[in-house]
C-alpha cells in the first residue's frame, strides 16, 4: 500500500478515504513533492505582503512587501518598514544618521564615512547623511604642477540587494 502512495505525483495527495487513490490538491492548497498524504494550505499574501507568485497545485505562493517595506527572513517571512536615505531604523523608529555616518539605502543602519587618509588619500567631496565621502589623490599628488584628478563615473552603488 505504501508503494501506491509513492506513485502520487506533486500536485496530488494520497487519499486514504478512497483506497489510496491519488487525488488532486483541493483549491488553495499544494504539494511540492510526490507521495504526500495531505496537501499544504497555500500562503496568503495579505496586509503588508503582496503576491509575487501565485500558488499552484505544485508550489506555494511567494510574497513580497508592499511599497514602503522590505522583506526579512527566508521566503520573505516578515516585512519591515523602510526609512529614508540618511536614516536608520532603530527599535524606536527611523532616526537620522549621526555626524560622520551615512546611509544610502532605505534599510540597514548608518555606516561610518570612509577615512581617506588610511589609504593615503585626501577628501575630494565631503560626506553627508546620505552619501559617503569621495576620496581623491593623495595630498602629495595635488602639489603645483600635478594634474587634477577626475573621479571615475560611479558604477551601481553598493546595497541594491535583489529580493
Amino acid at each position: 500500500l505504501q508503494d501506491l502512495c509513492s506513485n502520487c505525483p506533486a500536485g496530488t495527495f494520497c487519499d486514504n478515504n478512497r483506497s489510496q487513490i491519488c487525488s488532486p490538491c483541493p483549491p488553495n492548497s499544494f504539494s511540492s513533492a510526490g507521495g504526500q498524504r495531505t496537501c499544504d494550505i497555500c500562503r496568503q499574501c495579505k496586509g503588508v505582503f503582496k503576491t509575487r507568485k501565485e500558488c499552484s497545485s505544485t508550489s506555494n505562493a511567494e510574497c513580497d512587501c508592499i511599497s514602503g517595506y522590505h522583506c526579512l527572513g527566508a521566503e520573505c517571512s516578515m516585512c519591515e518598514q523602510d526609512c529614508k536615505q540618511g536614516q536608520e531604523l532603530t527599535k524606536k523608529g527611523c532616526k537620522d544618521c549621526c555626524f560622520g555616518t551615512f546611509n544610502d539605502q532605505k534599510r540597514g543602519i548608518c555606516r561610518p564615512w570612509t577615512n581617506c587618509s588610511l589609504d593615503g588619500k585626501s577628501v575630494l567631496v565631503n560626506g553627508t547623511k546620505e552619501r559617503d565621502v569621495v576620496c581623491g589623490p593623495s595630498p602629495a599628488d595635488l602639489s603645483p604642477g600635478a594634474s587634477s584628478a577626475t573621479p571615475p563615473a560611479p558604477a551601481r552603488e553598493p546595497g541594491h540587494s535583489p529580493q
Epitope: 526579512l72 536608520e88 532603530t90 527599535k91 549621526c98 555616518t101 546611509n103 539605502q105 534599510r107 540597514g108 543602519i109 548608518c110 555606516r111 561610518p112 570612509t114 577615512n115 581617506c116 588610511l118 589609504d119 559617503d132 565621502v133 569621495v134 576620496c135 560611479p154 558604477a155 551601481r156 552603488e157 553598493p158 546595497g159 541594491h160 540587494s161 535583489p162
Partner: antibody, heavy 120, light 110 residues
Framework: QVQLVQSGAEVKKPGASVKVSCKAS????????MHWVRQAPGQGLEWMGW????????NYAQKFQGRVTMTRDTSISTAYMELSRLRSDDTAVYYC?????????????WGQGTLVTVSS | SYVLTQPPSVSVAPGETARITCGGD??????VHWYQKKPDQAPVLVVY???YRPSGIPERISGSNSGNTATLTLSRVEAGDEADYYC????????????FGGGTQLIILG
C-alpha cells in the same frame, strides 16, 4: 549562484607582506561591500575591515590600520587584502565575506578561506 | 570598543534544546547576527538581525534579543549541529565597527 573563491595558502617570513585575493562571481561585484575576517588557530573570528568595490572606499579595524590595505580590480571582480610587516601572531585563516546589500545585516556569503602561515 | 561575551561551551543531549547567549551593554538596541563555524569550513550565517533565518537554515534554529542578552536557540539538536557559534554586531560609533563574540562550542553529548 554567488561564489567567492580565494587564493591558495601562503607561507611567509616575519616582516614580509602577503596579498590574498577573493574572486567573486554570480552577482554584480560593484554592488556589494566586501569584508575581510580572520581566524587564528584556536581563536575566534576577528573583523579586519571592508571595501566598497564601487568606489574603492575602505574602513579598517583600528588594530590593523597602517598594516592592512584593501583594494579591488573591478575588471576581474576581485578583491584583495594585503597585510604587511607580518608577525607570527598573524598566522590565521583569512576569509572574504560579502555584505548582503545594506549595512547592519549579517555577512551572507563567505570565501573558502586562505591559510597564511608566518614562520621564520 | 564594544564587547560581546559568550560562554566558552554549551553541552546538550541529542534531541534536546541548546541555548547560546551573547551578552553586551544594551545589546537589545543592536541587530545581532549568528554564524556557525565548523572545523576547516567557512562560517555560515544562521540568523541575522536578531531573529531572521536565511534560506536553507532549518526552522529549529531561532534567535531573540532584548536587554543585555541575545540568544541563539537550537531545538531538537542533532550531531551535525556540533560546531562553534559566534554572535556579531556592527558598532558604527567605534574604531572597530565589526565586533564578534568570542564564540561558543556546542557539544552534543553521547
Amino acid at each position: 549562484q554567488v561564489q567567492l573563491v580565494q587564493s591558495g595558502a601562503e607561507v611567509k617570513k616575519p616582516g614580509a607582506s602577503v596579498k590574498v585575493s577573493c574572486k567573486a562571481s554570480g552577482y554584480t561585484f560593484t554592488g556589494y561591500y566586501m569584508h575581510w575576517v580572520r581566524q587564528a588557530p584556536g581563536q575566534g573570528l576577528e573583523w579586519m575591515g571592508w571595501i566598497n568595490p564601487n568606489s574603492g572606499g575602505t574602513n579598517y579595524a583600528q588594530k590593523f590600520q597602517g598594516r592592512v590595505t584593501m583594494t579591488r580590480d573591478t575588471s576581474i571582480s576581485t578583491a584583495y587584502m594585503e597585510l604587511s610587516r607580518l608577525r607570527s601572531d598573524d598566522t590565521a585563516v583569512y576569509y572574504c565575506a560579502r555584505e548582503p546589500g545594506y549595512y547592519g545585516s549579517g555577512l551572507d556569503y563567505w570565501g573558502q578561506g586562505t591559510l597564511v602561515t608566518v614562520s621564520s | 570598543s564594544y564587547v560581546l561575551t559568550q560562554p566558552p561551551s554549551v553541552s546538550v543531549a541529542p534531541g534536546e534544546t541548546a541555548r547560546i547567549t551573547c551578552g553586551g551593554d544594551d545589546i537589545g538596541d543592536k541587530r545581532v547576527h549568528w554564524y556557525q563555524k565548523k572545523p576547516d569550513q567557512a562560517p555560515v550565517l544562521v540568523v541575522y538581525e536578531d531573529r531572521y533565518r536565511p534560506s536553507g537554515i532549518p526552522e529549529r534554529i531561532s534567535g531573540s534579543n532584548s536587554g543585555n542578552t541575545a540568544t541563539l536557540t537550537l531545538s531538537r539538536v542533532e550531531a551535525g549541529d556540533e560546531a562553534d557559534y559566534y554572535c556579531q554586531v556592527w558598532d558604527s560609533s567605534s574604531d572597530y565597527p565589526g565586533v564578534f563574540g568570542g564564540g561558543t562550542q556546542l557539544i552534543i553529548l553521547g
